[in-house]
C-alpha cells in the first residue's frame, strides 16, 4: 500500500520540515516560522504549540518537531504531553476544588500531587502496627503475633559463613 500511495501522490517525498505547496504547483516548501511537519509528505505544516502562562517551554519548536511544555514551579503536568498544569500541594495534603486540604485522619499522601489514600490495614494481613501512620506517611506493619511466639524471631539471622575447605561438623 505504501508503494502504491507514493506512486500516486506527488507529495509523498517532501521531507519532514517541509510541506507540499499547492500554491506553487506541488513543489516542497519549508515550513513557515512557528510551524513544523514531523513527517514527510505533508500538505500543510502544523502550528507550533506555545507554552504560555503556567506552562513553560521544555523544548523549543523546530521545523520538524513541536514544542514541548512543562509546568512552572508549584505546578505539575497532567494529561498526555502535559496538556494541563495542576497546582502542587504539600505532602500530607490533596487538591480539592477549594484548594489544598490536609489529609483526613486515617489517610496519607507522600507526594505533592494526587489524593490522600487510606493507611494500610495491617490486621488484614494478620500483622500489627509497628509505626503509626501520619498525614504524610503510611503505617508500617510489624510481624504477626504468631511470629512473636517463643522461639520465633521476627528477623531471620544470616547463615554463618563457612571457611573454605571445611565441611560442616
Amino acid at each position: 500500500f505504501e508503494r502504491t500511495r507514493s506512486l500516486q501522490d506527488p507529495c509523498s517525498n517532501c521531507p519532514a520540515g517541509t510541506f507540499c505547496d499547492n500554491n506553487r504547483n506541488q513543489i516542497c516548501s519549508p515550513c513557515p516560522p512557528n510551524s513544523f511537519s514531523s513527517a514527510g509528505g505533508q500538505r500543510t505544516c502544523d502550528i507550533c504549540r506555545q507554552c504560555k502562562g503556567v506552562f513553560r517551554t521544555r523544548k523549543e519548536c523546530s521545523s520538524t518537531s513541536n514544542a514541548e511544555c512543562d509546568c512552572t514551579p508549584g505546578f505539575h503536568c497532567l494529561g498526555a504531553g502535559c496538556s494541563m498544569c495542576e497546582q502542587d500541594c504539600k505532602q500530607g495534603q490533596e487538591l480539592t476544588k477549594k484548594g489544598c486540604k490536609d489529609c483526613c485522619f486515617g489517610t496519607f499522601n507522600d507526594q505533592k500531587r494526587g489524593i490522600c489514600r487510606p493507611w494500610t490495614n495491617c490486621s488484614l494481613d494478620g500483622k500489627s502496627v509497628l509505626v503509626n501512620g501520619t498525614k504524610e506517611r503510611d503505617v508500617v506493619c510489624g510481624p504477626s503475633p504468631a511470629d512473636l511466639s517463643p522461639g520465633a524471631s521476627s528477623v531471620t539471622p544470616p547463615a554463618p559463613a563457612r571457611e573454605p575447605g571445611h565441611s560442616p561438623q
Partner: nanobody, 121 residues
Framework: EVQLLESGGGEVQPGGSLRLSCAAS????????MSWYRQAPGKRREFVAA???????VYAESVKGRFTISRDNAKNTVYLQMSSLRAEDTAVYYC???????????????WGQGTLVTVKP
C-alpha cells in the same frame, strides 16, 4: 517567482563531452528534486535524468553510463555531464523542477527555456 536558466549547450562531435548547467532561483532548491528532459526535432519531450534532494539519482536507459546528473545546493545549480555523445543525443535539453521531490514517476512543476545540444561530425 520560480526561474530555471539552462546553459552549456552547443555543437560537439560524436564521442565528445558537454556539461549543462541549470541555475535555479525563487524556491528552496535544496529540498526539491531536479531533472533534465530533452526534445529532439519532431519528437516528444523525454526524460533524461533526475536527482532528489537527498541526491538519489534516476536515469533513462538510453543515457545510463554516459550521462551524470549532479547538484550543488550552495550554488542552487543542477548539472548534466554528458560524455560519449551520439547523433541521437541531439535535442533541446530542458531543466525541470519536479513536484514533491519525487524522482520515481516524476512530474514536472516548472520548466526552463532549454539549451540546444547538437552532435554532428
Amino acid at each position: 517567482e520560480v526561474q530555471l536558466l539552462e546553459s552549456g549547450g552547443g555543437e560537439v562531435q560524436p564521442g565528445g563531452s558537454l556539461r549543462l548547467s541549470c541555475a535555479a532561483s525563487g524556491f528552496s532548491f535544496s529540498i526539491n528534486a531536479m531533472s533534465w528532459y530533452r526534445q529532439a526535432p519532431g519528437k516528444r519531450r523525454e526524460f533524461v535524468a533526475a536527482i532528489e534532494s537527498g541526491r538519489n539519482t534516476v536515469y533513462a536507459e538510453s543515457v545510463k553510463g554516459r550521462f551524470t546528473i549532479s547538484r550543488d545546493n550552495a550554488k542552487n545549480t543542477v548539472y548534466l555531464q554528458m560524455s560519449s555523445l551520439r547523433a541521437e543525443d541531439t535535442a533541446v535539453y530542458y531543466c525541470g523542477l519536479l513536484k514533491g521531490n519525487r524522482v520515481v514517476s516524476p512530474s514536472v512543476a516548472y520548466w526552463g527555456q532549454g539549451t540546444l545540444v547538437t552532435v554532428k561530425p
